[in-house]
């Protein structure tokens, strides 16, 4: 939906309006789609085009958003790294998981260190 | 689970205005669309709007665009409903509730709204 | 705005009766469709979610079907708790909007 700009516009100079204010965005026909905000001072009023988004998938991208943790430490048994992710915000009609793994493989650089380490371990 | 607790309904002269609250508790209540749904006596449900917590995104049923305010309070896991210049039409018990299209919905119990002088 | 039509709009039925509700969309969304039961002085409670996706803790008694714009509710057979308003509600678009409901009476 369109977000709401009903901050006032200040007048041009020489107008008597020192402060517009505009209304919503309302589409020409059903809900979504063009449309004009209407916008008042004093006596004038003013039309200016502005459009309502149809379709929620364009609006909020992806589906699924997560807010992931920091990197976990390379397993060298794997040559992999994991992070968590946790649901931060879902398209309303997307069935996202509440928590999500990720993996990654180790830079050759953490890879040899997290082998370096294992090897001291053994000793 | 997610429960969500309603306060701030009541008796309201025409005109004037009422902040509805619906407290969440549980599971992480940023993460849902918290819906606004009301529901005159003896008759069926009428969708107010909806609001993310996490971005404060609000979609309003544009028959309310002029009569109803969404907000949130993460830091108290409270989502609002601000009502104004009401008539006696809007009469009615006014629900919240959290959606997840993966799990479902909980709902709140509802507060009943009286607009009458 | 999309329109949903109940029906029938009071059904009177026995317990051990197969109940069979019907929503009706003004035009196709998809699956978009979910169905509630409410009781008197208590919240709607979801049943069904996306046409035909059970809810946990929701007998299997309960089954939905769709897609497109002809949807039902069935309630293979009918226990005396059962007897409350039933309505659909679409999430295709906004503005999300309900059936008129369908009471289930005891007959």
């Known amino acids: 939906v369109a977000k709401k700009k009903d901050k006032v516009k200040k007048g041009g100079p020489g107008s008597e309006c020192a402060e517009w204010a505009w209304g919503p965005c309302t589409p020409s026909s059903k809900d979504c789609g063009v449309g004009f905000r209407e916008g008042t001072c004093g006596a004038q009023t003013q039309r200016i085009r502005c459009r309502v988004p149809c379709n929620w998938k364009k609006e909020f991208g992806a589906d699924c958003k997560y807010k992931f943790e920091n990197w976990g430490a390379c397993d060298g048994g794997t040559g992999t790294k994991v992070r968590q992710g946790t649901l931060k915000k879902a398209r309303y009609n997307a069935q996202c998981q509440e928590t999500i793994r990720v993996t990654k493989p180790c830079t050759p650089k953490t890879k040899a260190k997290a082998k370096a380490k294992k090897g001291k371990g053994k000793d | 689970q997610v429960q969500l607790v309603q306060s701030g309904g009541g008796l309201v002269q025409p005109g004037g205005s009422l902040r509805l609250s619906c407290a969440a508790s549980?599971?992480?209540?940023?993460?849902?669309?918290m819906n606004w749904v009301r529901q005159a006596p003896g008759q069926g449900l009428e969708w107010i709007g909806m609001?993310?917590?996490?971005?404060?995104?609000?979609i309003l049923n544009q028959k309310f665009k002029d009569k109803a305010t969404l907000t949130v309070d993460i830091s108290k896991n409270t989502a609002y409903l601000q009502m104004n210049s009401l008539r006696a039409e809007d009469t009615a018990v006014y629900y919240c509730?959290?959606?997840?299209?993966?799990?479902?919905?909980?709902w709140g119990q509802g507060t009943l709204v009286t607009v009458s002088s | 705005e999309i329109v949903l039509t109940q029906s029938p709009a009071t059904l009177s039925l026995s317990p051990g009766e197969r109940a069979t509700l019907s929503c009706r969309a003004s035009?196709?969304?998809?699956?978009?469709l979910h169905w509630y039961q409410q009781k008197p002085g208590q919240a709607p409670r979801l049943l069904i979610k996306?046409?035909?996706q059970s809810i946990s803790g929701i007998p299997a008694r309960f089954s939905g079907s769709g897609p497109g714009t002809d949807f039902t509710l069935t309630i293979s057979s009918v226990e005396p708790e059962d007897f409350a308003v039933y309505y659909c509600?679409?999430?295709?678009?906004?503005?999300?909007?309900f059936g008129g409901g369908t009471k289930l009476e005891i007959k």
């Open positions: 035009e196709s969304i998809s699956n978009n």
């Open positions: 549980g599971q992480s209540f940023s993460s849902y669309w």
């Open positions: 996306y046409a035909s």
């Open positions: 509730s959290s959606w997840s299209a993966k799990r479902g919905d909980f």
């Open positions: 509600q679409q999430s295709n678009s906004w503005p999300l909007t």
């Open positions: 609001i993310h917590p996490s971005d404060s995104e609000t």
